[in-house]
Interface confidence: low
């Protein structure tokens, strides 16, 4: 209930985060012309990334366009790319959707269609399908551990959501353990009323709030954190314009002293901490 | 490997014709992208024509689309490219080159090719 008497003071907060859990992907894997089944293990260094602010990504699922050398090559024929002839390609073009820089030739992509040749990371991208179901779907049973440290410069109070008390191998339940800070990344798409299997073939992004309504009065102190769930990017993906959550990144390597590169086009869940609340104290 | 042997080059007056024969031997040949390049005196060497391995598909220079035209015949191992209009700016040594490696189905670069043949001249004179 609302103090009236007291001085109320806002939130100061610094969040940080650890994520733990194996999956195990299986996919098709084409050697020397040969698709087979292909078997790797995903830890955390893997299947998360750092970002900036109070924010953590885990990958669920991926497109792999593999070694990639800068060369000349055919651009991928995306609607509106192919060409019957050099006129339809510009030299020195860059064209924001395509993948390099034009040289003026039209040439052949594959056995049927023609695409302007650019300068670029060859063979280009494809604009793939995210594989469905999700590669990293088992991402459902990892844990993140949720460490917050709040601050109250006004009244000088400080305290932590991890409690001496608490048991490391807790797991955060609305009911039988509201406290714990642990989270199932499953548990928290259920809390809010999401599937976590649908958001990881395209990605998405979650909210976590976590909510200090603190009373620093000595006679009725109380100062505990309370979470929430929420989805916070536009659900709807066959009417959003760009659906999902999605990045690329590259794993770069020689071979035969040739630079070449594994791009990857991670799809996940960016989870977002928000922390506010306010301090009362007469 | 593919061996490849050109002919059929020689001096010619602009507006005339000439067919450029390419025999291979090797066992590759007939699963294997064919193409022309040729090479004029302090220049590059430049993608002229290019013929798929079943023979069902080609792609041209646009400066030569309609003037020249690439077959092949896989039971007599091999291609031909047959030059109408000839023009004084056709005059290069020209190249057959085999694509082996199978890495694209239609090559274009030079790079794409692994057996090359010596080359035969042609001249057009005006």
């Known amino acids: 209930s609302d103090k009236l008497y007291q001085r109320k003071e806002p939130v100061i907060s610094s969040v940080h985060t650890k994520v733990k859990g194996i999956a195990e992907v299986t996919e098709n894997v084409t050697e020397g012309g040969v698709t087979k089944l292909g078997h790797s293990i995903f830890d955390t260094a893997d299947y998360t990334f750092p970002l900036q602010g109070n924010s953590f990504f885990v990958m669920t699922n991926y497109v792999k366009s593999e070694g990639q050398v800068q060369t000349l090559c055919p651009e991928y024929p995306r609607r509106g790319a192919q060409c019957s002839s050099d006129r339809r390609c510009k030299k020195g073009w860059m064209d924001p959707q395509s993948k390099g820089i034009q040289t003026g030739r039209c040439v052949p992509y594959d056995k049927t269609r023609k695409t302007c040749e650019v300068s670029a990371w060859c063979p280009t991208e494809e604009e793939k399908e995210a594989p469905r179901p999700a590669l990293l779907r088992s991402a459902e049973n990892f844990t993140v551990l949720i460490k917050n440290n709040i601050h109250f410069p006004g009244h000088n109070y400080t305290t932590r959501n991890i409690l001496p008390t608490m048991n490391g191998s807790c797991t955060f339940h609305k009911t039988w353990d509201p406290q714990c800070s642990i989270f199932r990344l499953g548990d928290i798409f259920q809390e809010a009323g999401e599937n976590f299997t649908e958001v990881a073939v395209q990605g998405g992004i979650m909210g976590i709030e976590i909510y200090w309504d603190c009373n620093l009065d000595s006679w009725s102190h109380h100062c505990r954190p309370r979470y929430s769930f929420r989805r916070l990017d536009d659900k709807n993906t066959d009417e959003s314009f760009v659906p999902g959550y999605n990045f690329r990144y590259a794993k770069y390597y020689k071979e035969n002293n040739v630079e070449k590169r594994t791009l990857i086009k991670a799809f996940g869940i960016r989870f977002d901490i928000l922390v506010f609340g306010t301090g009362g104290k007469f | 490997e593919v061996q490849l042997v050109e002919s059929g080059g020689g001096l010619v007056q602009a507006g005339g014709s000439l067919r450029l024969s390419c025999a291979a031997s090797?066992?590759?040949?007939?699963?294997?992208?064919v193409g022309w390049f040729r090479q004029a005196p302090g220049k590059e060497r430049d993608f002229v024509a290019t013929?798929?391995?079943?023979?069902?598909?080609?792609h041209y220079l646009d400066s030569v689309k309609g003037r020249f035209t690439i077959s092949r015949d896989n039971a007599l191992n091999t291609v031909h490219l047959q030059m109408h209009i000839l023009k004084p700016e056709d005059t290069a040594l020209y190249y057959c080159?085999?694509?082996?490696?199978?890495?694209?189905?239609?090559?274009?670069?030079?790079?794409?090719?692994?057996?090359w043949g010596q080359g035969t001249q042609v001249t057009v004179s005006s």
């Open positions: 080159a085999a694509s082996t490696s199978g890495s694209a189905y239609l090559p274009y670069r030079v790079y794409q090719y692994d057996s």
């Open positions: 090797g066992r590759t040949f007939s699963s294997s992208p």
């Open positions: 013929i798929s391995w079943n023979g069902v598909d080609t």
